[in-house]
């Protein structure tokens, strides 16, 4: 708390300008009218206030707006945003994408802070869904943003927003998240032709079911091994050797290097050794010739 003291004669601030950087903390408290500060917040960021001085300015705004700042003030907080706590931010009603961008810019280059996470949460909740423009903005500042959302939160992403997603935005997504995103991507890109469709859908294939992988294998897509290794194991297991060969095209040779890793290892164990041998890659571990394969899951379903 800054002690209340009278403003010295002649020091009452008439405008928010550079002269204020020479004011001591108590002088700022005594001589700067909070309403003047609020109407001239857009000028604060151009003035090199110290962190201590910014504390005083924040205190003044808190007193003026105990229920939370209006958006015009929020939009021009600049470095003062770094002084805000998540509790402060929860009082805000941020509806403008310009405001969001302005505050994300302040935090640019840093990890997502609790303040930024709270701001984004308030913004997205206020909008009701993660629209394309918002997603564009958030992933531009935080490429890993999408993968920080829970599957429940991702369910509010409309398919149209998927166009904003870049491959690197999905790098840290787990299978549960891709399970939610894949159907949206499939819907978003459904009107594209084969090769263009595959380029767009590729990053989302970690959520694809077996039948979609089978369909892709008929389209000469030449999936690379990195993408194949990210596929759901349960989606890969039912694929035949022929289907995997068609799916990977010239990249099929890469299976040898990955034969000890999932999903390749588990897939090999489900294939007849005869079929694996047709690939000419020396893959071992398939079902020996003459053995009968019982699909117990199917048997349980029938009984």
């Amino acid at each position: 708390e800054v002690e209340k003291t009278a403003c010295p004669s002649g020091k009452k601030a008439r405008e928010i300008d550079e002269s204020l950087i020479f004011y001591k903390k108590w002088e700022l408290e005594a001589c700067v009218d909070a309403a003047l500060l609020a109407t001239q917040m857009d000028r604060v960021n151009a003035i090199p206030f110290t962190y201590e001085q910014l504390d005083v300015l924040k205190h003044k705004l808190d007193e003026l707006y105990p229920q939370g700042y209006p958006e015009s003030v929020i939009q021009h907080l600049g470095y003062l945003f770094l002084k805000m706590s998540p509790e402060d931010i929860r009082k805000w009603n941020v509806t403008s994408l310009e405001t969001l961008k302005a505050l994300l810019e302040v935090n640019k280059g840093h990890e997502m802070s609790p303040q930024v996470a709270t701001l984004i949460d308030r913004f997205v909740k206020g909008r009701g869904q993660l629209d394309k423009d918002t997603l564009d903005t958030l992933t531009a500042f935080y490429p890993g943003y999408l993968c920080s959302l829970s599957p429940e939160e991702l369910s509010s992403v409309p398919p149209s927003s998927i166009w904003a997603v870049r491959p690197q935005d999905l790098d840290t997504c787990d299978p549960r998240q891709l399970d939610v995103l894949y159907p949206k991507a499939r819907l978003a890109f459904q009107n594209m032709n084969g090769s263009e469709y595959f380029v767009k859908i590729q990053s989302f294939l970690g959520g694809a079911p077996t039948e979609d992988l089978k369909a892709l294998s008929q389209q000469n897509v030449s999936m690379d091994l990195a993408t194949f290794m990210k596929l759901r194991t349960d989606a890969v297991l039912p694929l035949t050797v022929a289907e995997v060969q068609k799916l990977l095209g010239p990249h099929v040779e890469g299976l040898k290097a990955e034969e000890r890793h999932r999903p390749v290892r588990d897939w090999i164990l489900r294939q007849r050794q005869d079929d694996l041998d047709t690939l000419g890659l020396g893959l071992q571990g398939g079902i020996p010739n003459g053995y009968l394969v019982l699909d117990l899951s199917m048997q349980e379903a029938l009984s």
């Epitope: 405008e15 001239q40 857009d42 958006e71």
Partner: nanobody, 118 residues
Framework: EVQLVESGGGLVQPGGSLRLSCAAS????????MGWFRQAPGKGRELVAS????????YYPDSVEGRFTISRDNAKRMVYLQMNSLRAEDTAVYYC???????????WGQGTQVTVSS
Amino acid sequence: EVQLVESGGGLVQPGGSLRLSCAASGSTSNYYAMGWFRQAPGKGRELVASINSFDSITYYPDSVEGRFTISRDNAKRMVYLQMNSLRAEDTAVYYCAARKKGLAFSYWGQGTQVTVSS
């Protein structure tokens, strides 16, 4: 370039009221804020009221708080200053002003004289 033209000044008795008007040649919404300043003889120019264009947040110094009210009409490109309970110390030339985002008030009208005297 914006042009600001004030009107409504004059002679008024203490305790009386006046309404100043400011007509802007360009749209007032092009400016981050519009304001009224005054300058009494031998004194510096003083901001007495300002209003932000896009959300109507207002500011008044203690000397006029509760007595002066600033308002705007974007459609008519007008800014007003309603002055009530006028005092002798409110005597000054009153200037309409505008500013762009991040900048000081830098667009000024020619001023209108307000004299409070019995």
